[in-house]
Interface confidence: low
């Protein structure tokens, strides 16, 4: 078959691996593009072919599977590096084919260097721990499939540059790191180094993740509207600018969508025939509680606008709240000669 279903370069999978460490990379065809797995494909007589394009080159070339100590090998739908080298960086293609069928996808592989404190350009996963919530654990990620269950690796945990030993509230437990009680001071990068033997050689796997201590669900409350409130009256004369801030506090809630919006006379501002703009700013506390401010602005307010109802709404997974702003037309100051005199009943 001349034609090949080409899924192009799958940049969604920016694979990053550390230099001088083993890496196992599954062909993305079976995980994201095809409806059957490798075993089915293999049984149907399809062959999986690997090739690559070096960094800053256009030429596709076969992968050399005859390197000393089988440094690069293929096993089923997995491409193995034992270990990687910096110049393995490039775009890798896996192609599944027989005489009548062909499908292929490319993906970028970046071999990155780390310094002696595990700093690197690697994008780090973030693991959130609840503050003062009781025992919570993180697990050394992405180490499955590197060694059989009969092999017992040694695992060393580090916080930043320092080996975790005799820490007050952080205890290494093999592949897990237990936080007896998490505090803000536990924020930082945690690294597990897994060392295992294979065929007379020793390999290291380095995995770093960022721990972020966040607000506990025990302390979570529905959104709190700080502004508008009953103490502030927005009194304006026609022609002046009306500015009303809606400031809302949201407790941190895992995977909650926090929303703030204004209604004017019960409608969205876009549905009202007035020149209104809304600017939003967001700030976060150290535990990722969120404060959102939406400022409603009408440049030149009319007396009609000053009679409208302006309501700020907020919603999170904990509930929905609303608060109306008190908006009034400023009563012009009386002119003494006429109005005050009238007031005293003068004729």
């Amino acid at each position: 078959s001349e034609r090949c279903d080409d899924w192009g370069l799958d940049t969604m999978r920016q694979i990053q691996v550390f230099e001088d460490e083993p890496a196992r990379i599954k062909c993305p065809l079976f995980e994201h593009f095809l409806k059957f797995n490798y075993s089915t494909a293999h049984s149907a007589g399809l062959t999986l072919i690997w090739y690559w394009t070096r960094q800053d080159r256009d030429l596709e070339e076969p992968i050399n599977f005859r390197l000393p100590e089988n440094r690069i090998s293929k096993e089923k739908d997995v491409l193995w590096f034992r270990p990687t080298l910096l110049n393995d960086t490039g775009n890798y293609t896996c192609m599944l084919r027989n005489t009548t069928y062909c499908s292929k996808v490319a993906f970028p592989l970046e071999v990155v260097q780390k310094d002696s404190c595990f700093n690197s350009p690697m994008k780090l996963p973030v693991h959130k721990l609840y503050i003062e919530y009781g025992i919570q654990r993180i697990t050394c990620p992405n180490v499955d499939g590197y060694f059989p269950s009969s092999v017992k690796p040694t695992i060393t945990w580090y916080m930043g540059c320092y080996k975790i030993q005799n820490f007050n509230n952080v205890i290494p437990e093999g592949m897990n790191l237990s936080f007896l009680i998490a505090f803000i001071s536990n924020n930082g990068n945690y690294t597990c180094v897994v060392t295992y033997p294979e065929n007379g050689r020793t390999f290291h796997l380095t995995r770093t993740l960022t721990v972020k201590v966040v607000g506990s669900p025990k302390n979570a409350v529905p959104p709190v509207i700080h502004s508008p409130n009953d103490h502030v009256v927005y009194e304006k004369e026609p022609g002046e600018e009306l500015l009303i801030p809606c400031t809302v506090y949201f407790s941190f809630l895992m995977d909650s969508r926090n929303e703030v919006w204004w209604t004017i006379d019960g409608k969205k501002p876009d549905d009202i025939p007035i020149d209104v703009t809304i600017n939003e700013s967001i700030s976060h506390s150290r535990t990722e509680d969120e404060t959102r401010t939406q400022i409603l602005s009408i440049k030149k307010v009319t007396s009609e606008d000053l009679k409208r109802s302006y309501v700020c709404h907020a919603r999170s997974a904990k509930g929905e709240v609303a608060k109306a702003a008190t908006v009034k037309q400023k009563v012009p100051a009386p002119r003494y000669t006429v109005e005050l005199a009238c007031g005293f009943g003068a004729t």
């Epitope: 550390f18 310094d115 700093n119 540059c161 080996k163 180094v193």
Partner: antibody
Framework: EVQLVESGGALVQPGGSLRLSCIVS????????ITWFRQAPGKGLEWVAT???????YYASWAKSRFTISTDTSKNTLFLQMDSLRAEDTAVYYC??????????????WGPGTLVTVSS | DIVMTQSPSSLSASVGDRVTITCQAS??????LAWYQQKPGKAPKLLIY???TLPSGVPSRFSGSGSGTDFTLTISSLQPEDFATYYC????????????FGGGTKVVIK
């Protein structure tokens, strides 16, 4: 070919300051870690400080308060600012290129060294 | 900290001799060990890294072996230019930037 050359070594009085330079010829300084070592007369090698350009600086515990490592990547130069010098800081100071990211972290390239003598 | 102990601290040998220097780590460092040669008034020169790998340009009479805590540097046939001080250095402890050197072994003419 990459070369490292230190300079700035001198005779200085106790309590004085000195700034050592290490010029790196060849690839950009930002491509690898550079480390300062020192060797007192007749003694072994001692680590002083390491810089990973754009990432971090690291110091031996005894050097943290008195020594500062920095780079000027535009000039491809590494510096070691040494303050409050003491007689025991007398040594040949070497800059060396380290194996960034390598699990063995060997130092494959060294400068010839520059002599710092602290004496009154 | 991982402490590196080198032995002997000095040895005398003749040209053509087989010379062995040992280095012991206070805890396992896998194969993360380097060996350096230093001559008087000169900077150290990397001889071996990763316990047994020779950088290009290092003569094949130098070899390294070992893993875990015990390592050996062997010079199969000592040459006149090999009289120098040899240092081992551990590079395993990533959580401790202080890449520890052994105390050194001085090889002198018998």
């Amino acid at each position: 070919e990459v070369q490292l050359v230190e300079s700035g070594g001198a005779l200085v009085q106790p309590g004085g300051s000195l700034r050592l330079s290490c010029i790196v010829s060849g690839p950009s300084l930002s491509h690898f870690d550079i480390t300062w070592f020192r060797q007192a007369p007749g003694k072994g090698l001692e680590w002083v400080a390491t810089i990973s350009p754009g990432v971090s600086t690291y110091y031996a515990s005894w050097a943290k308060s008195r020594f500062t490592i920095s780079t000027d990547t535009s000039k491809n130069t590494l510096f070691l600012q040494m303050d409050s010098l003491r007689a025991e800081d007398t040594a040949v100071y070497y800059c060396a290129r380290g194996g960034v990211g390598s699990s063995w972290k060997a130092f494959d390239l060294w400068g010839p060294g520059t002599l710092v003598t602290v004496s009154s | 900290d991982i402490v590196m102990t080198q032995s002997p601290s000095s040895l005398s040998a003749s040209v053509g001799d087989r010379v062995t220097i040992t280095c012991q780590a206070s805890e396992s460092i896998s194969t993360a060990l380097a060996w350096y040669q230093q001559k008087p008034g000169k900077a150290p020169k990397l001889l071996i890294y990763k316990a047994s790998t020779l950088p290009s340009g290092v003569p094949s009479r130098f070899s390294g072996s070992g893993s875990g805590t015990d390592f050996t540097l062997t010079i199969s046939s000592l040459q006149p230019e090999d009289f120098a001080t040899y240092y081992c250095q551990q590079g395993f402890s990533s959580g401790n930037v202080h890449n520890a050197f052994g105390g050194g072994t001085k090889v002198v003419i018998k």
